[in-house]
């Protein structure tokens, strides 16, 4: 008789999750020689240990501490790019501007990017059928707690000028409920961070509005200012041209506003 299994509202663990994490770890340590000391077997054991045999609605940041310790990484604190609801462009940018880093350019972010995972209470099984949905089931699920933990640490490490890429096509350009709005904004350290500079990415080709005047951007400015961090904002009217100019800054067309 098959054992009763909790049905959650979200998709189950990504197929081949352990193999994918391991392969990504090996690949990352190959590309980043400064992380060659990392033992990928220990990383997988720590990752697994954070959620296996635990109730997937009762995961804590403490559960991920062994993994956080193994994945400790120094990135240039003044080269951090945060993003909200515009991941692909942020990643395209750091692939070109190699000295800047998103969270997914760090080992732990790279390992977990686009993956889902959860276990079951009191069994060593990985649940490939379903995992808790943040809204419909619970917020303290393995995936949400992981990203909250790594996002907090990433924001805490930032210094000088921190950049954030925001999606100007969304109704809430700045969303207080996003990871950026609920975690990263509140964990920037005023004694280290001088300025948060927002880049608002326009979606429409003929969109010439100043989205830096959007009410949600003003809300972000207010939150940041209250934390004694300066705020600045730029419109990126042509994201395609923006990327092209990052690749070829000497191009004559790159002197005009993008």
């Amino acid at each position: 008789v098959p054992r009763w299994r909790q049905q959650w509202s979200g998709p189950g663990t990504t197929k081949r999750f352990p193999e994918t994490v391991l392969a990504r770890c090996v690949k990352y340590t190959e590309i980043h020689p400064e992380m060659r000391h990392v033992d990928c077997q220990s990383v997988w054991d720590a990752f697994k240990g954070a959620f296996i045999s635990k109730h997937p609605c009762n995961i804590t940041e403490e559960d991920y501490q062994p993994l956080m310790k193994l994945g400790t990484q120094t990135v240039p604190c003044n080269k951090i790019l945060l993003w909200s609801r515009i991941k692909d462009l942020a990643h395209q940018f750091t692939q070109v501007q190699r000295d800047m880093f998103t969270l997914e350019d760090t080992l732990l972010g790279y390992l977990a990017d686009d993956l889902t995972w959860c276990g079951e209470f009191n069994t060593s099984k990985i649940n490939y059928q379903s995992c808790p949905d943040w809204r419909k089931d619970c917020s303290n699920n393995p995936v949400s707690v992981f990203w909250k933990t790594v996002s907090r640490r990433f924001a805490e490490a930032a210094c000088d000028v921190v950049h954030v890429m925001l999606n100007g096509s969304r109704s809430k350009i700045f969303d207080k409920n996003s990871t950026f709005g609920s975690v990263e904004v509140h964990n920037l350290q005023p004694e280290k961070v001088q300025t948060l500079e927002a880049w608002v990415i326009h979606g429409g080709r003929e969109d010439s509005r100043d989205l830096c005047q959007d009410p949600t951007i003003k809300e972000l400015e207010s939150i940041i200012s209250k934390r004694n961090i300066q705020f600045s904002c730029k419109n990126i009217y042509r994201p395609d041209k923006f990327l092209q100019c990052v690749k070829n800054p000497e191009d004559s067309s790159c002197t005009s506003e993008i």
Partner: antibody, heavy 120, light 108 residues
């Protein structure tokens, strides 16, 4: 065509360390994209995966053997090695080296295997 | 005792279809590979990523994998297919790659 060749002593005394080397020809270990693995087969029995190494030095071992296994790589000689410590008669087997893809399990090139007997 | 279970032996008449199964918990959520091993020889990869054949492997070999069972199917079986067949996949409980116990295919 990639070829793998195992070498090492065919007889090891109990409690000693078994040491084998796999020489790779027809392709470079350093080219990346592959795991270099050790697999063994007890006489008349099935196959058992021991572990792998990537050219960068990253390793992954069968958890049941991890405490006794060390796999190392020498890219300058285009070879990788296996050390299995504290051997017993239960470690008597044909030892194969093989090349596998990064999702593991798909070993497309194998050595011909070398029989290692553990006996005093 | 392997966590991937294969029947110890399968018999088939020449020209018939042989099916060799490999079962394990959540097997369909991991890639399965299959190997053919003739007596005194090294194993040969005949199927990877569930359904893909390496170059040089005849198209009479096919594979499938869903739920808890993977299957290697040999259609139009020939006497030269007589060998031991092993499946291999990642096992979550062991956190490593595991081979099935092997199936001896006899072509009668």
């Amino acid at each position: 065509k990639v070829q793998l060749q195992e070498s090492g002593p065919g007889l090891v005394k109990p409690s000693q360390t078994l040491s084998l080397t796999c020489a790779v020809s027809g392709g470079s270990i350093s080219s990346g994209g592959y795991y270099w693995s050790w697999i063994r087969q007890h006489p008349g029995k099935g196959l058992e995966w021991i572990g792998y190494i990537y050219y960068s030095g990253s390793t992954y071992y069968n958890p049941s053997l991890k405490s006794r296994v060390t796999i190392s790589v020498d890219t300058s000689k285009n070879q990788f090695s296996l050390k299995l410590s504290s051997v017993t008669a239960a470690d008597t087997a044909v030892y194969y080296c093989a090349r596998g893809g990064v999702m593991g399990g798909d070993f497309d090139y194998w050595g011909q295997g070398t029989l290692v007997t553990v006996s005093s | 005792q392997s966590v991937l279970t294969q029947p110890p032996s399968v018999s088939v008449s020449p020209g018939q279809t042989a099916s060799i199964t490999c079962s394990g918990d959540n097997l369909g959520d991991h890639y399965v590979c299959w190997y053919q091993q003739r007596p005194g020889q090294s194993p040969v990869l005949i199927m990877y990523e569930d359904t893909k054949r390496p170059s040089g492997i005849p198209d009479r070999f096919s594979g499938s994998n869903s739920g808890n069972t993977a299957t290697l199917t040999i259609s139009g079986t020939q006497t030269m297919d007589e060998a031991d067949y092993y499946c291999v996949a990642w096992d979550d409980s062991l956190s490593g790659w595991v081979f099935g116990g092997g199936t001896q295919l006899t072509v009668l």
